[in-house]
């Protein structure tokens, strides 16, 4: 039930915490974790619904 | 769909250990933080604590040494222990999911309302 | 920990009616990493809370576009358009981005007038 990582910086962190593409980073401890750890959104195929518009999937968010 | 589903005793007596669990079905509780927060009477919500990914825990500092969260990967489950209970313990306890994209409590229990009296 | 002060307590209202709930947090919720984490929920009698705006500005999924959520560095408001109905319950707000402890406002009860 993994929502795998994403790559695509959005508009609305200007400053985002750098990390690699495959990695998230976590408020809670302050740094870049595995995204498969966090609790992040899936890509779904065209046409699902989504649990949230993330029109901004950024994993430095 | 993740769901979520708080058991325990509804009536605890004063200076008593609540123990609450949280089953959890849609997602693994190997992933992500999982939390525990309830609501008092008159609509207060206190952030009680989680447990992490990696077993990890974060107790809110006005519980003291008195509550534990822990876990169960092989039931998929997570559990509270509040000891030496008292009437101002008397609430609705949820556990919840959180986002870890935006950080927002996406997934909450139904609640389970949990009273402290002798 | 951060105190997140919301008001009013209490706001009654007219089914078609605006209705406009503040939120003050002690700290600017503007994270280093440049996003504000503040978010709102309601929670419907009986129910448990449910997200309603997340990251001050953004509508969960489902919610009408009847909600909306404006503010920056303490200040914030949610309105509703126009009230239903269904509508009716607490309003909290929160804050993600001084954690941990989360914390969440005192709740603004909507009720009818």
């Known amino acids: 039930m993994r929502r795998g990582p994403r790559s695509l910086r959005g508009r609305d962190a200007p400053a985002p915490t750098p990390c690699v593409p495959a990695e998230c980073f976590d408020l809670l401890v302050r740094h870049c974790v595995a995204c498969a750890l966090l609790r992040t959104p899936r890509p779904k195929p065209a046409g699902a619904s989504s649990p949230a518009p993330r029109t901004a999937l950024q994993p430095q968010e | 769909d993740v769901q979520l589903q708080e058991s325990g005793p509804s009536l605890v007596k004063p200076s008593q250990t609540l123990s609450l669990t949280c089953s959890v079905t849609?997602?693994?509780?190997?992933?992500?933080?999982w939390n525990w927060i309830r609501k008092f009477p008159g609509n207060k919500l206190e952030y009680m604590g989680y447990?992490?990914?990696?077993?990890?825990?974060y107790y809110n500092p006005s519980l003291k040494s008195r509550i534990s969260i822990t876990r169960d990967t092989s039931k998929n489950q997570f559990y509270l222990q509040l000891l030496s209970v008292t009437t101002e313990d008397t609430a609705t306890y949820y556990c919840?999911?959180?986002?870890?994209?935006?950080?927002?409590?996406?997934?909450w229990g139904a609640g389970t309302l949990v009273t402290v009296s002798s | 920990d951060i105190v997140m002060t919301q008001t009013p307590l209490s706001l009654p209202v007219s089914l078609g009616d605006q209705a406009s709930i503040s939120c003050r947090s002690s700290?600017?919720?503007?994270?280093?990493?440049?996003?504000?984490?503040l978010h709102w929920y309601l929670q419907k009698p009986g129910q448990s809370p449910k997200l309603l705006i997340y990251k001050v500005s953004n509508r969960f999924s489902g919610v009408p576009d009847r909600f909306s959520g404006s503010g920056s560095g303490t200040d914030f408001t949610l309105k509703i358009s126009r009230v239903e109905a269904e509508d009716l319950g607490v309003y909290f707000c929160?804050?993600?981005?001084?954690?941990?402890?989360?914390?969440f406002g005192s709740g603004t009860k909507l009720e009818i007038k």
């Open positions: 447990i992490s990914y990696s077993g990890s825990t």
């Open positions: 849609g997602d693994s509780i190997t992933s992500g933080y």
């Open positions: 919840a999911g959180l986002d870890g994209l935006y950080w927002y409590f996406d997934v």
């Open positions: 929160s804050q993600s981005t001084h954690v941990p402890p989360f914390t």
């Open positions: 700290q600017s919720l503007v994270h280093s990493n440049g996003n504000t984490y």
